[in-house]
């Protein structure tokens, strides 16, 4: 969380941003809130990106003002216009690109004053893994697959029964470049698995950490997956 305050001149207002990550090819949110104003026409929101010649987005007098928007953001940005009056200056960024990563500034002017706060936006690819029993294999084998990751993640296997065990000798991980030549499909195979145990396939890069669990018993297979974004700090 980053909390910024206004500078000289008028009074300062508090602006708060939260560091976040974007999944390339999908839509992302750059979060920013501020002390609200009574009149929408008195609110100016400017989103800037460090090292970019034009604006990322500008909202003033109740509508978008995009005459000085940088071409790399053209047609890809929107504020939540109906929420600006309550102090939400968050920006929706469509079709996140790898090059969208960087430092952004949320700059606010209201009748009360000015304020700004920066946020770090990371971009990459992350997806939920799915763990399945590989019935084609000669021995009991688990296969963990996740369709889109970038940068290249690490994959670690763990088991509930053998806690702390190192499975690197009995597993094999491969990374296959997807058709757009950026993201990769992650496939990890774990050999010699035992029945009545819960195994976890953990995939992690500097943006996200995802876990796929599988519990194999005589009678059933239970699966569970979850994904967590790393380093979501507010400013």
């Amino acid at each position: 969380l980053i909390i910024g305050f206004g500078i000289s001149g008028r009074h300062s207002i508090t602006v708060t941003t939260v560091a976040s990550a974007g999944n390339i090819g999908e839509d992302g949110i750059l979060s920013c809130t501020f002390e609200p104003d009574i009149k929408l026409s008195d609110i100016v929101i400017q989103w800037l990106k460090e090292g970019v010649l034009g604006l990322v987005h500008e909202f003033k007098e109740g509508k978008d003002e995009l005459s000085e928007q940088d071409e790399m953001f053209r047609g890809r940005t929107a504020v939540f216009a109906d929420q600006v009056i309550v102090g939400n200056a968050s920006l929706r960024l469509k079709n996140v690109q790898l090059t969208d990563a960087g430092t952004y500034k949320c700059y606010i002017i209201t009748s009360k004053g000015k304020g700004n706060a920066n946020l770090e936006y990371k971009t990459g690819a992350f997806s939920m893994p799915e763990v399945n029993v590989d019935y084609n294999a000669s021995s009991e084998t688990l296969r963990c697959e996740a369709p889109r990751w970038f940068p290249q993640p690490t994959v670690v296997w763990a088991s509930q029964v053998d806690q702390g065990a190192n499975f690197s000798e009995v597993s094999n991980t491969s990374f296959e470049l997807n058709s757009e030549n950026v993201t990769m499909k992650v496939v990890s195979v774990l050999y010699n698995v035992t029945i009545n145990n819960t195994y976890s396939c953990m995939i992690e890069n500097d943006i996200a950490k995802a876990t796929g669990d599988i519990k194999v018993t005589e009678s059933e297979i239970k699966r569970r997956s979850h994904l967590q974004l790393l380093n979501s700090k507010a400013s």
Partner: antibody
């Protein structure tokens, strides 16, 4: 201390190609857009091209669009200008300059290299 | 692209004179205007940015004013080291356009 050092200039025939480099030091290179500016002998300054800090946006003067390509390698703190289909009128001293950090806030063109001479002649 | 026109293209002045150079943009560039000084054989040097903000280390005899389409660079009392060529530059659009330059010579 901020330093910008251009290299790669020289004599080239019309229609030929050349790649200029600009090695930067003394500042966080990826935080700044960078520009190339040229000056023909005895003439004024002409902005040629710019690139955003992350390399996601590139901008060109009409006179070089389609012939020149600007790029950067932030891991090497280096800016490039690939010049193809060169013409006699491209003859100039080429300067790299540090461009803007934040739109509307920061100074720009506050540091320049010493320049590298490109001569296009048969 | 925004076109920048400087006037005069050259002027002769004496040490101690007050010198004014004007720059006109073909369309509004808000306050996104810089002034640079260049001496023969040297790289340009930034004097003024955002129309009127003095770059660090530049003497206070240099000042800039204006917004929109009309801008002015003033040297309040010309010094021997000020004889050079001065360029205005807009950065209100993605392109960065320079004026044609004003050469300040010794009278």
């Amino acid at each position: 201390e901020v330093q910008l050092l251009e290299s790669g200039g020289g004599l080239v025939q019309p229609g030929g190609s050349l790649r200029l480099s600009c090695a930067a030091s003394g500042f966080t290179f990826s935080s700044y857009a960078m520009s190339w500016v040229r000056q023909a002998p005895g003439k004024g300054l002409e902005w040629v091209s710019a690139i955003s800090g992350g390399g996601g946006s590139t901008y060109y003067a009409d006179s070089v669009k389609g012939r020149f390509t600007i790029s950067r390698d932030n891991s090497k703190n280096t800016l490039y200008l690939q010049m193809n289909s060169l013409r006699a009128e491209d003859t100039a001293v080429y300067y790299c300059a540090r461009d803007i950090q934040w739109y509307g806030e920061s100074t720009l063109f506050d540091y320049w290299g010493q320049g590298t001479l490109v001569t296009v002649s048969s | 692209d925004i076109q920048m026109t400087q006037s005069p293209s050259s002027l002769s002045a004496s040490v101690g004179d007050r010198v004014t150079i004007t720059c006109r943009a073909s369309q509004s560039t808000r306050s996104w205007l810089a002034w640079h000084q260049q001496k023969p054989g040297k790289a340009p040097k930034l004097l003024i940015y955002k129309a009127s903000s003095l770059e660090s280390g530049v003497p206070s005899r240099f000042s800039g004013s204006g917004s929109g389409t009309d801008f002015t660079l003033t040297i309040s009392s010309l010094q021997p080291e000020d004889f050079a060529t001065y360029y205005c530059q807009q950065y209100g659009s993605y392109s960065r356009t320079f004026g044609q330059g004003t050469k300040v010579e010794i009278k």
